[in-house]
Amino acid sequence: CEALQCWRLFNNSRCDPACSSPACLYDNFDCHAGGRERTCNPVYEKYCADHFADGRCDQGCNTEECGWDGLDCASEVPALLARGVLVLTVLLPPEELLRSSADFLQRLSAILRTSLRFRLDAHGQAMVFPYHRPSPGSEPRARRELAPEVIGSVVMLEIDNRLCLQSPENDHCFPDAQSAADYLGALSAVERLDFPYPLRDVRGEPLEPPEPSVPL
């Protein structure tokens, strides 16, 4: 972001047009239809989490601030994936996180105002891996060889902008996972990340290029 003052203005709840660019994290959506105050109606929030990606189109939840209903209303619209993968380290073990996966994805989609889903591996399974307590290198070898304690999950997410880009104000969609990660980091830095899942780390990663073909 070229304009250095944008970091001071990110949390001022006023539209600063010079800062409303992807590089400047859209001025925290302050220039965007009521800005940050446009959140999912608390009356609908629980309902929209319950019905997120449930296979039924709920128009009341099919809004950016409610997470686009998990794309239930967009099955006929082709996917438009942002570049890269959003990688979150969440301090909840995988089985616990997956139990509340719809709520997790709905809330994160609402924060980023676009659609998120788990990246799938070659076997069609969600890419949610155990995150182990980092062990100090000074520990005795025998201690280190015990199964390390799982204290969280490493979660790989895809960003699908198909509805974000269709919305009237479509200039705020994250073009890549890194810009979404930067936005979450900025929210966290100014203590405005209203997300009940404890995040340890957020980053964007490029997709691995395809394996080079082996010459015959």
């Epitope: 309902y47 997120f52 296979g55 039924r56 998990g70 099955s75 996180l97 997956l98 996966s101 788990f118």
Partner: antibody, heavy 119, light 107 residues
């Protein structure tokens, strides 16, 4: 064409286990939410549970009478939905249907498989 | 859990009759109400979704109305193939629940 075929039903003793399968064809199974519904002989329909697509965590929800005893899972590589039933009771005797939920309500149901729990 | 209560539990009618079946939810379910038809030995068939929307391929003599807690399925002119059991179902909150069914028999 779009089709769901249940299998795995049969006679089992109370306390026993059974795994039902639902083979899907004619559509992209991996993207759909899938349900199990049952119907005891001569009785009404009862929702058993559902499972979301793996891209949304593959999380399952259950009706109270089966929670903790039944597990819904899916294998997208085999286009198959499963219902693992443990600690079966006589009141679990029913025809079990799998069904596909669809945003535009083009629902699809299987023909059902009969599970009889009796000593 | 949301309880769904259908009435009547059974009715006798003649071909050409207008038939009305009601369904009441124990709490508001907005318009998250579906109607199914089931014939003996067959899987249920969706007739009406979201309280009033006719499923494609279903004859226009079937209609649904209502919102909140009270809903109605109407068959404007009963045909021989309509003799079956009808169920309402809410999909507002899990666990999804069905009414106990209404059996429509020939008078």
């Amino acid at each position: 064409q779009v089709q769901l075929v249940e299998s795995g039903g049969g006679l089992v003793k109370p306390g026993g286990s059974l795994r039902l399968s639902c083979a899907a064809s004619g559509f992209t199974f991996s993207t759909y939410v899938m349900h199990w519904v049952r119907q005891a002989p001569g009785k009404g329909l009862e929702w058993v549970g559902r499972i979301r697509a793996n891209a949304y965590g593959g999380a399952a929800d259950y009706a109270a009478p089966v929670k903790g005893r039944f597990t819904i899972s899916r294998d997208d590589s085999k286009n198959t939905l499963y219902l693992q039933m443990n600690s079966l009771k006589t009141e679990d005797t029913a025809v079990y249907y799998c069904a596909r939920a669809e945003a535009r309500y083009r629902d699809v149901w299987g023909q059902g498989t009969l599970v009889t729990v009796s000593s | 859990d949301i309880q769904m209560t259908q009435s009547p539990s059974s009715l006798s009618a003649s071909v050409g009759d207008r038939v009305t079946i009601t369904c009441r939810a124990s709490q508001s379910i907005s318009s998250h109400l579906n109607w199914y038809q089931q014939k003996p030995g067959k899987a249920p068939k969706l007739l009406i979704y979201a309280a009033s929307n006719l499923q494609s391929g279903v004859p226009s003599r079937f209609s649904g109305s209502g919102s909140g807690t009270d809903f109605t399925l109407t068959i404007s002119s009963l045909q021989p193939e309509d003799f079956a059991t009808y169920y309402c179902q809410q999909d507002y909150h899990t666990p999804f629940t069905f009414g106990q069914g209404t059996k429509v028999e020939i008078k």
